[in-house]
């Protein structure tokens, strides 16, 4: 089935240079229970929430978000209005966190490329990532010099060797594309405090052993870990998705009934029903 992935694409509107749109999507078999979009970093790790979208309850958004909406059942868009003349969005990291069943929470971040042509970004396609040192060598000049043909050659060559795990790099801000692909790491969460901010996420795959008070019995094995972030096909990037902060990483009990769960079991961060997701309602 493969590891779930979250993609993030940031684009400047061709008509209004002060308008940006963040597109996020989830690639995985699970049922999405919540999407959180933040800027300045991951949600709960220095980032500031811009919008929260629930597939049934609606969406919530806060300035400078202008319109948050579901584009498909597994992707969302968030339009942003940049009131400042200096266009701060251009240098900002946007992160999308998808809570899904049974995979847990997955988060990726991306930003507008330094020299992006407005309105030209195409929805990304997941492919194996380029090695960070290779991407750094190529850089923007490499992209301009050798063009798409050389990129395709690199990607083709990359497919024939194992993908290394990429560590977060101080040069992450030099990403050359708005389409940052990076599945977040998932591992087992502690049961001690269901409301604590934790650095990992685990959603029990089998909730049939959930306790009456809403706790789920966690399996003893650790959750699978993704073997490496993936990059978009458009231009070489440096991985920016190896970091993740997940709040309320346990999902059980009540209300919505995603596929393959027993009656009364669902995906809500406070383990007690739809109450535990941060805000709702749609566009202003």
């Amino acid at each position: 089935a493969g590891t779930p992935e979250v993609w993030v694409q940031v684009q400047m509107e061709a008509t209004e240079l002060s308008s940006f749109t963040v597109h996020c999507g989830f690639l995985g078999p699970g049922s999405i229970s919540l999407v959180t979009v933040s800027w300045g970093g991951p949600d709960g790790a220095g980032g500031t929430k811009l919008a929260v979208l629930h597939p049934e309850l609606g969406t919530r958004q806060w300035a400078p978000a202008r319109q948050a909406r579901w584009e498909t059942q597994s992707s969302i868009s968030l339009a942003l209005e940049d009131s400042g003349a200096s266009s701060p969005f251009a240098n900002t990291t946007f992160c999308c966190k998808f809570a899904s069943f049974p995979e847990g929470s997955w988060e990726s971040c991306g930003s507008l490329p330094p020299s992006s042509d407005p309105g030209l970004s195409a929805p990304p396609t997941p492919v194996p990532i380029l090695r960070a040192d290779l991407a750094g060598i190529l850089g923007l000049s490499g992209v301009l010099l050798f063009g798409c043909g050389y990129l395709l050659h690199l990607l083709r060559r990359q497919k024939h060797r194992p993908t290394p795990r990429l560590q977060p790099s101080h040069t992450n801000s030099q990403a050359l594309t708005a389409q940052a692909w990076a599945p977040s790491q998932a591992s087992q969460a502690a049961l001690h405090d269901p409301y604590a901010t934790i650095n990992t996420s685990f959603c029990p795959a089998t909730l049939d052993t959930a306790h009456p008070n809403g706790w789920a019995s966690l399996p003893t094995h650790a959750a699978h870990q993704p073997q490496g972030p993936a990059a978009s096909a458009s231009t070489p990037i440096l991985a920016r998705g190896s970091f993740v902060s997940v709040e309320n990483g346990l999902y059980t009990q009540a209300g919505e009934r995603p596929p393959h769960t027993g009656p009364g079991l669902t995906l809500f961060p406070d383990c007690r029903g739809p109450r535990a997701l941060e805000g709702r309602f749609g566009v202003r």
């Epitope: 709960g44 500031t48 929430k49 629930h54 597939p55 049934e56 309850l57 609606g58 919530r60 958004q61 806060w62 300035a63 909406r69 579901w70 584009e71 498909t72 059942q73 409301y195 901010t197 709040e247 309320n248 961060p269 406070d270 029903g273 739809p274 109450r275 535990a276 997701l277 941060e278 805000g279 709702r280 309602f281 749609g282 566009v283 202003r284």
Partner: antibody, heavy 114, light 113 residues
Framework: EVQLVQSGAEVKKPGSSVKVSCKAS????????IEWVRQAPGQGLEWIGE????????NYNEKFKGKATFTADTSTNTAYMELSSLRSEDTAVYYC???????WGQGTLVTVSS | DIVMTQSPDSLAVSLGERATINCKSS????????????LAWYQQKPGQPPKLLIY???TRESGVPDRFSGSGSGTDFTLTISSLQAEDVAVYYC?????????FGQGTKLEIK
Amino acid sequence: EVQLVQSGAEVKKPGSSVKVSCKASGGTFSSFSIEWVRQAPGQGLEWIGEILPGSNSTNYNEKFKGKATFTADTSTNTAYMELSSLRSEDTAVYYCSSYWFAYWGQGTLVTVSS
Amino acid sequence: DIVMTQSPDSLAVSLGERATINCKSSQSLLNSGNQKNYLAWYQQKPGQPPKLLIYGASTRESGVPDRFSGSGSGTDFTLTISSLQAEDVAVYYCQNAHSYPPTFGQGTKLEIK
């Protein structure tokens, strides 16, 4: 389970202000919106607005801009709504709510009377 | 703002009988992207805050008896109580959960005949 406990009833003079509090427990206070809803005697429900305590981001119903001001104190898990320039028509029960209006405070009756 | 209009304003139904409350929105509450309707139903008993019954037009909140059901799409929605119980006497509100600001219907008072 998340609980929202509001401050007690208030009787105020026209032109004065009142600050209603809403203390949350049992959840991550800074991660979810606190909504404020008004219900005048014998009337329906009106959304006043919301605050996201972690960032103090707010959304206001246009009707209540200038009338209501939201603040939040994450150290005490308490959200506040201040109503200014009170008039008799502001007499109502004011509710705080959260998590898609699934959790509600017990309500605070604010009576404006000379 | 989206205007929510409920009908009837009041309703008297015999115990064990079916009660139906309608709600009409001035704009569609259907999101075309994921084909979900953003409408919620609440029950409010005297002296109590409202209680969430239904969200997403048809999904019952945890702990809500299965005699309560929601249906509809777009601009027309219905709350049905299949077999009225004495404890169901209350005022029922529908609510737009699609667009800011969230707006409520004027309420329908349900009584026992």
